[in-house]
């Protein structure tokens, strides 16, 4: 059962796992949600009736029954983890805490103009978990405007105290706001020889990398595969750090793999969701339950639905035994990972999918597309929407992309002459325009947010957000696309597609069926040569074949240039402008979405 509200002046008795410090009960709830075992918590707020050493304590708790006895206590705030909830969860915390000093290891001290600048510095520093900033009103002259970057083993403060004229806050890495590089490569036959901060068992290097990503201190990892010569180290995932933030030594060793934390790319790839099945593999751990199940998929469902289950092993039924049902062992451990991994026993193992909701919805794999041909199939581009205008008659105006359950990203130039959002309708899950009848459901538009630097498409800033009047329920035919990670600026995308209902030649009509075309990206230098009369800025991205032939055209504006990278689709561009359509040496010009991630997040996360 999902309980989101906080219980004031209430304390949960017993069940303690660990105590951390958080600046608010709300953040305590987030910490509890992300902890592998925490189901309930009790937070102590500042209060004259409480011992100041207990202020800001966040006690994480577990219970076999998923609840604990309640006791009345002033200043105590209790609640439940969001593990029990189906809604999307984010660790992003933009709050600034006034007059609070969050204690940790102060490893960097510098002058900053503002708390915001200090927070940005923390976000862009690989080690920083949180910061404290002394304002210009701080009594001690030499400490004024000092920005202290801090880290701890847990990622949360070791203590929080009241201190006048300072402000504290957290790194915004989990808000996708870091400019740090996103290195997704996994290096085979490589060991990073740096200090280990922790070690866990993992079935493969990908899971190891994802564990590293959500471990607060892990910057890179080394994984020993099941073929590793030393038996006791097989399937061992070593979580590592270094002062420089990079591995100091790389040793060539067969059957080992190494890689980096995906902290700077976590909004565009799954880091919590371990969805694969591991055949002929048994996960050991504390047994929660043994249930009969028809298949390993059914076993995974059972684990996902049991809030305390972290991983499972399924043993298939022996011929015609137990109505063809096998045994499903639901398991847990202190850190969410198996205590040991064994091979060759015939089991099929995997993890709960409950953690998938901690990842962005956009990272969900969509059904395989049919390559070749220009007409799309249903569900192939589930983020693509058709934006209609109803005045004076209803028709398709532009494309757009679902980027959140209330947000469509599109082009600013689509709204030339549009005097009110009331005349707009957003249709999602549409393949053919002919499906749209008078009674077809649509999303009304509450607000059109156009970039304030937009003047005309050809000079850039051709980007706009539509806030929908109601929320989109995600299904196979309507779901969001990931925004590119700022850390991915240097990624070379090779699998890019433009989609829309636009013309197939310059003078044509809107197509009935959603069209698709695979189009290669073109460097900005090359693009600039093709548009000498224009300034192709870094906020634009171009795509096209030198010989022409495939391109976006009229009616595709605002729609996506979608690029697949590491099995996840990213919204790399927004169809904007170009000379003619599909002309030789005239690439299409798109809004370069990665350059607007901050703007998008600022507008969509505004209170």
């Amino acid at each position: 059962e999902c309980v989101t509200q906080l219980l004031k002046d209430t304390c949960f008795e017993g069940g303690d796992i660990t105590t951390v410090f958080t600046p608010s009960a709300k953040y305590c709830q987030v910490v509890c949600t992300y902890h592998p075992r925490c189901l309930l918590f009790t937070f102590t707020a500042e209060s004259p009736s409480e011992d100041p050493t207990r202020w800001f304590t966040c006690v994480l708790k577990d219970s076999v029954t998923e609840t604990l006895p309640r006791v009345n206590r002033t200043a105590a705030i209790s609640g439940y983890s969001f593990k029990q909830c189906s809604h999307q969860i984010s660790a992003c915390n933009k709050d600034i805490y006034v007059d609070l000093d969050m204690k940790g290891i102060n490893y960097n001290s510098s002058v900053a103009k503002s708390a915001q600048e200090c927070q940005e510095r923390c976000t862009d520093d690989v080690h920083c978990h949180f910061f404290t900033y002394a304002t210009r009103q701080f009594p001690s002259l030499e400490h004024r405007n000092i920005c202290l970057l801090k880290h701890t083993q847990t990622g949360t403060p070791t203590r929080i105290t009241k201190l006048d004229k300072v402000v504290s806050g957290f790194s915004l890495k989990s808000c996708a706001l870091s400019n740090l590089a996103c290195i997704r490569d996994i290096f085979p036959n490589t060991v990073f020889a740096d200090s280990n901060i922790d070690s866990v068992m993992a079935p493969d290097a990908f899971v190891c990398g994802r564990i590293c990503t959500h471990h607060p201190g892990c910057l890179f990892f080394t994984f020993f595969s099941q073929e590793w010569p030393k038996e006791s180290q097989r399937n061992l995932c070593l979580l590592k750090t270094s002062e420089s933030g990079l591995p100091s030594t790389r040793i060539k060793k067969s059957k080992a793999l190494s890689g980096f934390s995906l902290q700077s790319c976590r909004h565009s790839i799954p880091v919590f969701c371990h969805s694969s099945f591991y055949h002929d593999t048994d996960f050991l751990g504390e047994e929660l339950d043994i249930v009969a199940a028809k298949s390993h998929e059914a076993c995974q469902k059972l684990c996902t639905n049991a809030v305390r289950c972290q991983f499972f092993t399924y043993t298939p039924a022996q011929a015609s035994c137990n109505e063809g049902k096998g045994k499903c062992y639901l398991k847990l451990s202190s850190n969410g990972s198996p205590t040991k991994i064994l091979h060759g026993r015939g089991g099929i193992s995997g993890y709960t999918l409950r953690l998938c909701k901690m990842d962005n919805e956009c990272t969900t794999k969509i059904k395989p597309r049919i390559v070749g041909g220009t007409a799309s199939v249903r569900g192939e581009w589930p983020w693509q929407v058709t934006l209609h205008t109803t005045s004076p008659t209803q028709r398709h105006l532009c494309g757009g992309s679902i980027i959140g359950n209330q947000w469509i990203l599109t082009a600013a130039h689509c709204f030339y002459g549009v005097e009110s959002p009331k005349i707009l309708r957003v249709y999602s899950g549409i393949l053919n325009q002919s499906e749209i009848k008078e009674d077809t459901s649509f999303f009304g538009v509450q607000e059109i947010i156009i970039h304030d630097q937009y003047k005309m498409a050809e000079s850039g800033y051709d980007i706009a957000l539509l806030k929908l009047e109601t929320t989109v329920n995600y299904t196979d035919s309507q779901r969001p696309i990931c925004l590119p990670s700022k850390g991915d600026r240097n990624v070379i995308y090779t699998d890019c597609w433009v989609t829309g209902w636009g013309y197939r030649k310059l003078r044509d009509k809107i197509q009935n069926t959603l069209q698709k075309a695979k189009i290669p990206l073109v460097t900005n230098e090359e693009c600039q040569k093709r548009y000498r009369g224009h300034k192709i800025t870094h906020k634009m991205i171009c795509a096209g074949y030198r010989e022409g032939g495939k391109d976006a055209c009229k009616g595709d504006s605002g729609g996506p240039l979608s690029c697949k990278h590491n099995e996840v689709w990213h919204l790399v561009g927004i169809t904007s402008w170009g000379e003619g359509c599909a002309q030789r040496e005239r690439p299409g010009v798109y809004t370069n979405v990665v350059e607007y991630v901050d703007w998008i997040l600022e507008k969509t996360q505004a209170v």
Epitope: A411, Y416, I510, G533, K554, S557, T575, W577, G578
Partner: antibody, heavy 124, light 107 residues
Framework: EVQLLESGGGLVQPGGSLRLSCAAS????????MGWVRQAPGKGLEWVSS????????DYADSVKGRFTISRDNSKNTLYLQMNSLRAEDTAVYYC?????????????????WGQGTTVTVSS | DIQMTQSPATLSLSPGERATLSCRAS??????LAWYQQRLGQSPRLLIY???SRATGIPARFSGSGSGTDFTLTISSLQPEDFATYYC?????????FGQGTRLEIK
């Protein structure tokens, strides 16, 4: 202020040549398709020619094809119409106009800015 | 070429009255149609683009409708400054064509 200013008109004998210019100001010239439209005395508007933003594509009315050449110099923000083998029926006020064509929404934006016109008289 | 035919050639109305001007294309031009107003001795001025969208600064009494081959320009309540010649123009074909014009005169 967005402006188009035609020049180069005048009196010319049949078979003669004339070069019209249109100086653009107040907007990014290289972003717009440009065109020439003429109006014979007491008659309606007649489209003459159009040119794409880069100058790579040109179109002409059948009545002027092979005799007139449209061109542009984006570095000078200027549109040209070279008129050769002029005939009496080419006598008209010649207007230059701009047209927004580069955005990829399906709307036709029309010729939204016009010059004041320059008069061409072809007579012996 | 696509022929554009406007009717009537002349329309005589009084201020305050409603004016309805027609334009027919010899084949479909989708919504690639614009309307222009030309007052005596002046350059043409864009009124309606994309068949039905009012250009910047054009009063709300002007409206356009239609798509395909049949189009209409309506002036809901004529003002003295509206008496002028009106042209429709298609750009669906790369050979642009104008209608012959409708002269709107004071009755």
């Amino acid at each position: 202020e967005v402006q188009l200013l035609e020049s180069g008109g005048g009196l010319v004998q049949p078979g003669g040549s004339l070069r019209l210019s249109c100086a653009a100001s107040g907007f990014t010239f290289s972003t717009y398709s440009m065109g020439w439209v003429r109006q014979a005395p007491g008659k309606g508007l007649e489209w003459v020619s159009s040119i794409s933003p880069s100058g790579g594509d040109t179109d002409y009315a059948d009545s002027v094809k092979g005799r007139f050449t449209i061109s542009r110099d984006n570095s000078k923000n200027t549109l040209y119409l070279q008129m050769n083998s002029l005939r009496a029926e080419d006598t008209a006020v010649y207007y230059c106009a701009r047209e927004r064509t580069m955005v990829r929404d399906p709307r036709y934006y029309g010729m939204d800015v016009w010059g004041q016109g320059t008069t061409v008289t072809v007579s012996s | 070429d696509i022929q554009m035919t406007q009717s009537p050639a002349t329309l005589s109305l009084s201020p305050g009255e409603r004016a309805t001007l027609s334009c027919r294309a010899s084949q479909s031009v989708s919504s690639y149609l614009a309307w222009y107003q030309q007052r005596l001795g002046q350059s043409p001025r864009l009124l309606i683009y994309d068949a039905s969208s009012r250009a910047t600064g054009i009063p709300a009494r002007f409206s356009g409708s239609g798509s395909g081959t049949d189009f209409t320009l309506t002036i809901s309540s004529l003002q003295p400054e509206d008496f002028a010649t009106y042209y429709c123009q298609q750009s669906y074909s790369n050979l642009v064509t104008f209608g012959q014009g409708t002269r709107l005169e004071i009755k």
